[in-house]
């Protein structure tokens, strides 16, 4: 921000009324009036260029310092070219000297040179040559100097002429203030600029109404430089919840809008499925039946639990069931839908039912499923199973009702046994099998059916209560088709896959495990 100038003395604005002191009296400096741009202007002028040893002083009136620490002196002046005078005026100069003196009282007409301290020699950038003078082109020079720190009640300025042809058209003395400033929603008071060029006065800012320093943020501070400019902003204020930045102020959110935290962001419109908010709202309440999960941002619409899975099928495959379903028709407005599968088994004889989570195996964990299918295995034969698939989302936990669909399935067969070739010779094959333990109690015997490959007219059957059998009297180097089936009280279980096993050729005789 630009520095604010507080004027202590302005000769040009005074219209020749200041009555400055000249020394020696009646010689040297002279107050004169001229016409410029059809306006009368006053100037202090001296032009004793033909006489040597000039020492003409012009002293201002006493200037009250007030709160100023460093003053700035702006001079507007014109200097005639020494060569514009006949013979070059050998004693002519083109500079003058600027002095100041501090005092606690006005000395009036008592002028003492020794009290004055030189500020600088003032030289023009442009001199007025004959043609400019003739054409009344005033070559105006502007020079600025500063003095500080000042400590007394007031001061004088003085101008010493040593033989120049010079006119002072403007003498303006001012000090600088950093103006009152609103920045980053912080108010900084008007501050007097310091006197030492390298130093910067640190000024604390105050947050405007309804603004605060953000958590973990720095308090607002600015630095008032010697030239009255604010520099190096540190920290900031932000509008509190329910308020947004409008120009340099925090304004309450309009009805139907909200802001839930201290931030730079504007108020947001209340999202879908919320009630209209009052002015200055920090949040928007959900409509009845709609909810907000704890992790949901306030800007997200309110949502509700999903409806039940749309379509559920249970396809039995022996002692396995594949459950398939489609997503709910109403997601509740959320994308975080997960499914939970629960299982209940019922004994047909007694009609008694109970949970079966511990006795069945799922192809993936049955809670928090994101896919829409799962396979359940290790089911017991001749048992009724009911599967429940529940759809849940982030707000399901906020209501007591549940959204689910059920499917029932009866297991009539055991699972097909898993068959392995344990060993073979030229005339025998040793075969073993397994079925899930829960089903083993239901099995009475296992039936092994085998025949030569390509011979569809005859086959052999062996029954056993164990889990293995050796098939003898087989032809060497011959492929046999083997299938194992469980036999239960209720009938036959599912048959295994038909396996092809080959006996050894006579050259590679001897028992060999595979």
């Amino acid at each position: 921000a630009q520095g604010k100038e507080v004027v202590l003395l302005d000769f040009a604005a005074a219209g020749g009324e200041l009555g400055w002191l000249t020394h020696p009296y009646g010689k040297g400096w002279d107050l004169m009036q001229n016409i410029m741009n059809d306006m009368p202007i006053y100037m202090y002028s001296v032009c004793n260029v033909m006489s040597g040893d000039q020492d003409n002083w012009l002293r201002t009136n006493w200037v009250y310092r007030g709160e100023a620490e460093r003053i700035f002196i702006e001079l507007k002046f014109t200097v005639r070219d020494c060569n514009s005078f006949p013979g070059g005026a050998s004693s002519c100069k083109e500079t003058f000297n600027l002095y100041y003196a501090e005092s606690d009282l006005d000395y009036g007409t008592n002028f003492q040179k020794r009290l004055f301290t030189k500020i600088d020699t003032i030289a023009p950038d442009e001199i007025t040559v004959s043609s400019d003078f003739e054409a009344r082109h005033v070559k105006l020079n502007v020079e600025e100097r500063s003095v500080g720190p000042l400590t007394r009640k007031g001061f004088y300025l003085a101008f010493q002429d040593i033989g120049a042809c010079v006119a002072l058209l403007s003498v303006r003395v001012y000090y600088k203030k950093c103006p009152e400033l609103l920045q980053s929603l912080a108010r900084f008071p008007e501050t007097i600029a310091g006197s030492d060029a390298p130093s910067l006065a640190t000024v604390a800012g105050t947050c405007v109404d309804h603004a605060v320093v953000p958590p973990g943020g720095e308090e607002p501070r600015m630095h008032c430089a010697v030239d009255g400019e604010w520099l190096v902003p540190i920290g900031q204020c932000l509008c509190q919840a329910g308020y947004e930045k409008v120009e340099d102020a925090c304004q309450a959110c309009s009805p139907g809008f909200f802001k839930f935290e201290v931030s730079e962001s504007p108020c947001l419109e209340c999202p879908e499925h919320t009630l209209p908010s009052p002015e200055g709202a920090t949040s928007c309440e959900c409509e009845e039946g709609f909810f907000r999960a704890p992790q949901d941002p306030m800007s997200m619409p309110c949502t509700r639990p999903p409806s039940a899975p749309h379509y559920l099928t249970a396809v039995g495959m022996g002692a396995k069931v594949e459950l398939r379903w489609t997503p709910p028709q109403d997601s509740g407005g959320r994308e975080d839908i997960v499914y939970s599968v629960t299982c209940e088994q019922c004994w047909p004889e007694s009609g008694e039912c109970g949970p079966c989570e511990s006795s069945v195996r799922y192809s993936e964990p049955p809670h928090g499923l994101t896919r829409t299918s799962v396979t359940v295995s290790d089911l017991e034969p001749h048992m009724n199973y009911t599967f429940t698939v529940e759809a849940r989302n982030g707000v399901s936990g906020l209501v007591t009702s549940r959204s689910f669909r059920t499917a029932s399935v009866s297991i009539n067969q055991t699972e097909p046994p898993k068959v392995r070739l344990e060993g073979r010779s030229t005339t025998s094959l040793s075969v073993s099998w397994s079925i899930p333990p829960p089903q083993q109690s239901r099995v009475w015997k296992y039936e092994v059916t085998y025949r030569k490959k390509g011979d569809s007219n005859s086959y052999n059957v062996r029954r056993t209560e164990g889990f293995s059998v050796t098939l003898d009297d087989l032809a060497p180097d011959t492929t046999y088709l083997v299938q194992v089936q469980a036999l239960t009280q209720e009938g036959q279980g599912a048959g295994s896959k038909v396996h092809e096993f080959q006996t050894l050729s006579p050259e590679g005789s001897g028992s060999l495990a595979v």
Epitope: T78, S130, C165, A167
Partner: antibody, heavy 128, light 107 residues
Framework: EVQLLESGGGLVQPGGSLRLSCAAS????????MAWVRQAPGKGLEWVSR????????HYADSVKGRFTISRDNSKNTLYLQMNSLRAEDTAVYYC?????????????????????WGQGTLVTVSS | DIQMTQSPSTLSASVGDRVTITCRAS??????LAWYQQKPGKAPKLLIY???NLHTGVPSRFSGSGSGTEFTLTISSLQPDDFATYYC?????????FGQGTKVEIK
């Protein structure tokens, strides 16, 4: 030494014309503002016209505006005053006068000029 | 136009006298005033410019003062060569008007 010598004066009838000349010597003519000042018999001085060092700007007294024309030829070091539509009240001694800013020891030029050097004058009589 | 009024119109004085002639402007002319001396049948001569500045070669018995509307020409000790008519002239405006003149004659 600065010398200004007027010529061209004489008797002329009302409504007639006359051209005055002023020959300059002893100074750099092209540096000077030049002017004509007249003095009616037994009366005071009256400024008539002025011309800048390079030929402009020109100014005229209200009493002669539109009738008199001032000009100069710096190559000939000569100032002229062309007088048309002469009237009886134009009867006067006409002086040519010069001003050199170099001899004006002020920092800022005055709004107009004064006259540092004068010729001896030439008499113009307008009469029927 | 700015009117310049001189007083007195005629002044009788003796050699060695201190003589003061006054010139009044109808409006402020700051210090833009010149004084001339004219002897019968001769051209005027510049004495003072900018109210108080002595022109080159003019004797120091001549001095000028004043500003605004009131100006004076002073001859500190009248000499025989000083009997003449004196004119003031303002050059604060382009009209460059003269006063009507003050004749200084031998008493």
């Amino acid at each position: 030494e600065v010398q200004l010598l007027e010529s061209g004066g004489g008797l002329v009838q009302p409504g007639g014309s006359l051209r005055l000349s002023c020959a300059a010597s002893g100074f750099t003519f092209s540096h000077y503002m030049m002017a004509w000042v007249r003095q009616a018999p037994g009366k005071g001085l009256e400024w008539v016209s002025r011309i800048g060092p390079s030929g402009g700007p020109t100014h005229y007294a209200d009493s002669v505006k539109g009738r008199f024309t001032i000009s100069r030829d710096n190559s000939k070091n000569t100032l002229y005053l062309q007088m048309n539509s002469l009237r009886a009240e134009d009867t006067a001694v006409y002086y040519c006068a010069g001003y050199d800013s170099g001899y004006d020891y002020v920092a800022v030029a005055g709004p107009a000029e004064y006259f540092q050097h004068w010729g001896q004058g030439t008499l113009v009589t307008v009469s029927s | 136009d700015i009117q310049m009024t001189q007083s007195p119109s005629t002044l009788s004085a003796s050699v060695g006298d201190r003589v003061t002639i006054t010139c009044r402007a109808s409006q402020s002319i700051s210090t833009w005033l010149a004084w001339y001396q004219q002897k019968p049948g001769k051209a005027p001569k510049l004495l003072i410019y900018k109210a108080s500045n002595l022109h080159t070669g003019v004797p120091s018995r001549f001095s000028g003062s004043g500003s605004g509307t009131e100006f004076t020409l002073t001859i500190s000790s009248l000499q025989p060569d000083d009997f003449a008519t004196y004119y003031c002239q303002q050059y604060n405006s382009y009209s460059r008007t003269f006063g009507q003149g003050t004749k200084v004659e031998i008493k």
